[in-house]
Interface confidence: medium
C-alpha cells in the first residue's frame, strides 16, 4: 500500500448539488439499434457518435444511421447526419480515426449492389466538415493510417487488391493484387503477404512476404513459404513452413526483413499457433500453443534480438488461434503482467509477474477476504482475476481488468478469492501497488473507469434492471459516495470517458424503454467541482515501486533499476489536471546474475542462476541461425535481459565461444531474395 495514508473516509461535501449542476442529459432522436462512439484527437473534447438501425427486409437489409458530434466532452451533441448526406454507414468498419491529433476521420458507407466501388466520407477538421469520395474498389477492411503520415492510407479490397492513397483518400491506386494481409511498418513501409495459386486459404504456408518502402513504386520479396506474419515493437516476425514436414517456425528480423534469424522457439504443427502477447522495442512475450486441443501453451520471453527465448510460464491459458487469453499488461507499473494458467485439474488460476516474465506468482489474498469454497485450505488461497476468458464464458463479468499509465500503481479487476476462478458472481478488487496487494473495492460486478489520473474512480453496478445511480471515490476506492444522476432509470449500456484517464468527464450511455418507443440517452457528468482546487506539492507523497523490504539496499530493483514516484495522497481531494505528468525518480541498481538471461547454446539448470553450456545442439529442437556478421555468433553465455539497466556488480565473464559451427538453418538465404519494381 502507498504510505502516509489516512484510513478515515473523507466525505466530499455538498457533492449532490455540485454534480447536479454538472450533469448533462442528451436524448438521441432515433430508434435503438446499435451505437458506437469515438473520440477524435486528444484533449479536444470532440466525440463522434454513430447510431445504426437495421430493418431486415425480405431480400436485403435496409439500414439508417445517424451521426452526432460533441465538442464539449459529450455534454451537448449536434446531429450532423446531413454532412454525410444521410448515408448508411457500415458499422463493421466503425469510424477510422487518424493518429495523434491529426483531426482526421474516415467513415465507410454502405452502397447499393452493382456499384463500381465503395464510398467514404473524409474529414480533416475533427469532423466539422466531410468530403464524399467514391472509391474505385469495394473495401474489405477499415482504412489504415500510416503511423508516420496520416495522409497515407491503405486498404484491402474484396478482390484482394492492396490499395494505397497518398492524399488522405482523395485518390487511390492499386499497388498489388492477390494480397492476404497488409500492415504499416515504420517509416511508411508496408508489409504484405501474397498468394500465387488462387486464394489466401489455399496458399497458407506458401505465401510470399513482400515489402514496399515507397508506397508501391518498388517491391522486395523478403520471405517465402510464409504462413503468417506480425509486427511487434521493432521486430518483424514470420511463421515459415519447414521443408520436410507440415510444421512451421518463427523467424525474426530487426532490419525490416533484409536479414532473418530463426527464433529459438519450438516448431508448431498444423493445429497449433504462435501468438505475440506483448511487444515493445526491448523484447517480446510469445505464446506457443501445445500440441492437441489442450487450451494452453507456453509463454516465452525474448532477448533484445528477438531470437533467444526463455521459458517464462507453463500451461498458459489460450483457447484457440484468435481465441481467448487473459494476458494483461498492467500499464500502471513497469514490468507487471497478469494472466491465467490452466492447472492440472483444469481449474483456472491467475498468475502475476513483476519483472517482465522472469518469475510468476499467485496474487496475494486480499486482507479481510475469506477463501471461498474453491479453497481446500480456508486460510491459504489467492485472488483470481476475471479477464477475457471469463467474459467469453458469459460469467457475470462486465469488464476486463483496468490500469492506466498515468494512474500509477492502480489496477482494478473483478475477482474471486480461492484456489481458482469461481463461477460465482465476482466482486471488484483494487490494487494501489501494481498488483502486489489487493483490497475488495466493491461488492458484486461493476463497470468502472479512472478519471483525472486516478484522482477519481467511477463505478456503476452491473444489473439487468434499469439504473440511475453512479458511485464515485476520491481516495482510490476506499470510500464510495453515490449520486442519483436521473429520476428516471435507464437500461445501462456503457461508460465512456476520454482515453488516457485525464478527463474529469464521464458519459453514462443507455436507453429508455416505454411501451411504444425506445431511445438512446447519455448523461455526461463533469466532476470538476468535486475536485475544487488544483493539487499542490503537499498533496503528493513519495512511493517506491516494487518495494518489499525497505531495509534491503536493493529493495525495489526491477530489471536493474528502481523508481520512486510522487503519488497523490488518498486523503487529498484535488485535481491532478489534464497536464499532469507522472513524476518519477529512477536509480540504477547493481547487476546480479538475475539481470542476465542465458544466451543461445546455454541454459540454467533448475534452482541455479548460472548459465551452463548445452552439450550438443546439432539437430536440437531449438536450433536456430543468425544471418549476418560472424561476430554475432560469439557469446559468453550470458545476455543482459532486454530493458535491464543495471550497472556494476556481477559481470559474468567467461571464455567467448564461436557457435557458428552449431548453427543450422535453411530459411531465406540471401540468394532467395529478389527485388522487383512496378
Amino acid at each position: 500500500s502507498a504510505p502516509g495514508e489516512d484510513e478515515e473516509c473523507g466525505r466530499v461535501r455538498d457533492f449532490v448539488a455540485k454534480l447536479a449542476n454538472n450533469t448533462h442529459q442528451h436524448v438521441f432522436d432515433d430508434l435503438r439499434g446499435s451505437v458506437s462512439l469515438s473520440w477524435v484527437g486528444d484533449s479536444t473534447g470532440v466525440i463522434l457518435v454513430l447510431t445504426t438501425f437495421h430493418v431486415p427486409l425480405v431480400i436485403m437489409t435496409f439500414g439508417q444511421s445517424k451521426l452526432y458530434r460533441s465538442e464539449d466532452y459529450g455534454k451537448n451533441f449536434k446531429d450532423i447526419t446531413d454532412l454525410i448526406n444521410n448515408t448508411f454507414i457500415r458499422t463493421e468498419f466503425g469510424m477510422a480515426i487518424g493518429p495523434e491529433n491529426s483531426g482526421k476521420v474516415v467513415l465507410t458507407a454502405e452502397v447499393s449492389g452493382g456499384s463500381r466501388g465503395g464510398r467514404i466520407f473524409r474529414s480533416s477538421d475533427f469532423a466539422k466538415n466531410f468530403v464524399q469520395t467514391d472509391l474505385p474498389f469495394h473495401p474489405l477492411t477499415q482504412m489504415m493510417y500510416s503511423p508516420q503520415n496520416s495522409d497515407y492510407l491503405l486498404a484491402l479490397s474484396t478482390e484482394n487488391g492492396l490499395w494505397v492513397s497518398k492524399n488522405f483518400g482523395g485518390k487511390w491506386e492499386e499497388i498489388h493484387k492477390a494480397v492476404c494481409l497488409a500492415k504499416w511498418g515504420s517509416d511508411n513501409t508496408i508489409f504484405f503477404t501474397t498468394y500465387a495459386n488462387g486464394s489466401c486459404k489455399a496458399d497458407l504456408g506458401a505465401l510470399e512476404l513482400w515489402r514496399t518502402s515507397d508506397l508501391g513504386k518498388s517491391f522486395k520479396t523478403i520471405g517465402v513459404k510464409i504462413y503468417s506474419f506480425g509486427l511487434g515493437g521493432r521486430f518483424l516476425f514470420a511463421s515459415v513452413m519447414a521443408d520436410k514436414d507440415t510444421t512451421r517456425r518463427i523467424h525474426v528480423s530487426t532490419d525490416q526483413g533484409d536479414t532473418w534469424s530463426m527464433a529459438q522457439l519450438p516448431s508448431v504443427g498444423q493445429e497449433q499457433f504462435y501468438s505475440i502477447l506483448a511487444a515493445n522495442d526491448d523484447m517480446v512475450f510469445m505464446h506457443v500453443d501445445e500440441p492437441g486441443d489442450t487450451g494452453f501453451g507456453t509463454i516465452f520471453t525474448s532477448d533484445d534480438r528477438g531470437i533467444v527465448y526463455s521459458k517464462s510460464l507453463d500451461r498458459h491459458l489460450y483457447t484457440t488461434t484468435g481465441g481467448e487469453t487473459d494476458f494483461t499488461n498492467v500499464t500502471s507499473l513497469r514490468g507487471v503482467y497478469i494472466t491465467s494458467v490452466l492447472s492440472e485439474d483444469n481449474s483456472i488460476q491467475t498468475m502475476i509477474t513483476f519483472d517482465q516474465g522472469g518469475r510468476w506468482t499467485h496474487l496475494r489474498k486480499p486482507e479481510n477476504s475469506e477463501c471461498d469454497a474453491t479453497a481446500k485450505n480456508k486460510n491459504e488461497c489467492s485472488l483470481h482475476i476475471h479477464a477475457s476468458y471469463s467474459i467469453s464464458q458469459k460469467l457475470n463479468v462486465p469488464m476486463a481488468p483496468l490500469s492506466e499509465p498515468n494512474a500509477v500503481g492502480i489496477v482494478i479487476a473483478h475477482g474471486s478469492v480461492g484456489d481458482a476462478i469461481s463461477v460465482m458472481v465476482p466482486d471488484v478488487y483494487i490494487s494501489d501497488d501494481g498488483g502486489a496487494s489487493w483490497t475488495k473495492m466493491l461488492e458484486g460486478p461493476h463497470y468502472y473507469t479512472i478519471l483525472d489520473s486516478g484522482g477519481i474512480i467511477v463505478a456503476i453496478e452491473h444489473s439487468s434492471r434499469p439504473i440511475n445511480v453512479i458511485k464515485f471515490s476520491t481516495d482510490e476506492g476506499q470510500c464510495w459516495q453515490t449520486y442519483t444522476f436521473t429520476r428516471d432509470p435507464i437500461y445501462f449500456t456503457g461508460l465512456a470517458s476520454e482515453p488516457g484517464a485525464r478527463s474529469m468527464n464521464i458519459s453514462i450511455w443507455g436507453f429508455t424503454e416505454s411501451f411504444l418507443t425506445s431511445q438512446w440517452v447519455s448523461y455526461t457528468i463533469d466532476f470538476k467541482d468535486i475536485l475544487e482546487r488544483n493539487c499542490e506539492e503537499k498533496d503528493y507523497t513519495i512511493w517506491l515501486a516494487h518495494s518489499t523490504d525497505p531495509e534491503d539496499y536493493e529493495d525495489g530493483c526491477i530489471l536493474g533499476y528502481k523508481e520512486q514516484f510522487l503519488r497523490l495522497r488518498k486523503s487529498s481531494v484535488c485535481q491532478n489536471g489534464r497536464d499532469y505528468v507522472v513524476t518519477k525518480q529512477p536509480s540504477i541498481c547493481l547487476c546480479s546474475l538475475e539481470d542476465f538471461l542465458c544466451d543461445f547454446g546455454y541454459y540454467r539448470p533448475e534452482n541455479d542462476s548460472k548459465c551452463v553450456e548445452q552439450p550438443e545442439l546439432k539437430g536440437h529442437d531449438l536450433e536456430f541461425c543468425l544471418y549476418g556478421r560472424e561476430e554475432h555468433l560469439t557469446t559468453n553465455g550470458y545476455r543482459k535481459i532486454p530493458g535491464d539497466k543495471c550497472q556494476g556488480g556481477v559481470n559474468p565473464v567467461r571464455e567467448v565461444k564461436d557457435l557458428k559451427k552449431k548453427c543450422t538453418s535453411n530459411f531465406l538465404s540471401p540468394e532467395k531474395q529478389n527485388s522487383k519494381s512496378n
Partner: antibody, heavy 129, light 107 residues
C-alpha cells in the same frame, strides 16, 4: 453423517413468494457450494442456481433471474431459496444439493466436477388459486 | 446454455442383462459430467462424477465413460434395485444443465 434437511411442504397462491430452507450438518458448511434443483410432476430435473456459503455470492440460471434469491446463514448452517411471483408452472419438488464445484473449468480433461453428492429430501411447493 | 440430450427415453431390460445409456452434449463439456439415479418419491443419488469415477458406495456394476460431447453409463448386470430413472448433468459452463432422463424398466 452428512445430511441436508429441508423445510416442509408449502401451498401458495399465484403471485405469492415461497422461501424454502435447507439445513446442513455433518460437514463444514462453508467448504461446499449448494445448488438448488427442482422437479415438476412427471418431469426431469432443472438446475436453478448455486450459492457460495462463503460470502453468499450466487449464480442463477437465466430462467429464474430476477425471481429467485438464494441466501445463507452461516451461524445456523442453513441456505434459503426464495422464489417470487409464483405461477402454476412453479409447482414442483425443490431440492437443495451439496455441490463441490463452482470452479470455472477450461480445457478438455477436467477432473474437477465431483457431482452433487448429497441431496435434501425435497420440499413440495404447490401453486394453486 | 449447453443442452444435454439422453437416449433412449425408455430402456426395457431383463434382470441380469447389460444396460447402456447415452448422453450427448450440444458442445464439449470435457469430463465435467455426472450421472444420477432417481427412484419414485426419492431424491436423486449421485452415481458417477468426472464422467467416469464412481461415487462413494456405488457398486462396481455401474461404469461411466466418454469425454467431450458423447457419454455413456453402463450397468453391466441389472439388479432389481437398478430399475429407475437416470439423469446426466454437465457442470462445464453455467448454468448447470440436466438431460431429460432415461427410464430403465423391467422387460
Amino acid at each position: 453423517q452428512v445430511q441436508l434437511v429441508q423445510s416442509g411442504a408449502e401451498v401458495k397462491k399465484p403471485g405469492a413468494s415461497v422461501k424454502v430452507s435447507c439445513k446442513a450438518s455433518g460437514y463444514t458448511f462453508t467448504s461446499r457450494y449448494m445448488s438448488w434443483v427442482r422437479q415438476a410432476p412427471g418431469q426431469g430435473l432443472e438446475w436453478m442456481g448455486i450459492i457460495n456459503p462463503v460470502g453468499g455470492s450466487t449464480s442463477y440460471a437465466q430462467k429464474f433471474q430476477g425471481r429467485v434469491t438464494m441466501t445463507r446463514d452461516t451461524s445456523t448452517s442453513t441456505v434459503y431459496m426464495e422464489l417470487s411471483s409464483l405461477r402454476s408452472e412453479d409447482t414442483a419438488v425443490y431440492y437443495c444439493a451439496r455441490d463441490p464445484s463452482g470452479i470455472a473449468a477450461a480445457g478438455p480433461a477436467s477432473r474437477y466436477y465431483y457431482g452433487m453428492d448429497v441431496w435434501g429430501q425435497g420440499t413440495t411447493v404447490t401453486v394453486s388459486s | 446454455e449447453i443442452v444435454m440430450t439422453q437416449s433412449p427415453a425408455t430402456l426395457s431390460v431383463s434382470p441380469g442383462e447389460r444396460a447402456t445409456l447415452s448422453c450427448r452434449a450440444s458442445q464439449s463439456v470435457s469430463s465435467n459430467l455426472a450421472w444420477y439415479q432417481q427412484k419414485p418419491g426419492q431424491a436423486p443419488r449421485l452415481l458417477i462424477y468426472g464422467a467416469s469415477t464412481r461415487a462413494t458406495g456405488i457398486p462396481a456394476r455401474f461404469s461411466g465413460s466418454g469425454s467431450g460431447t458423447e457419454f455413456t453409463l453402463t450397468i453391466s448386470s441389472l439388479q432389481s434395485e437398478d430399475f429407475a430413472v437416470y439423469y446426466c448433468q454437465q457442470a462445464r459452463l453455467g448454468p448447470w444443465t440436466f438431460g431429460g432422463g432415461t427410464k430403465v424398466e423391467i422387460k
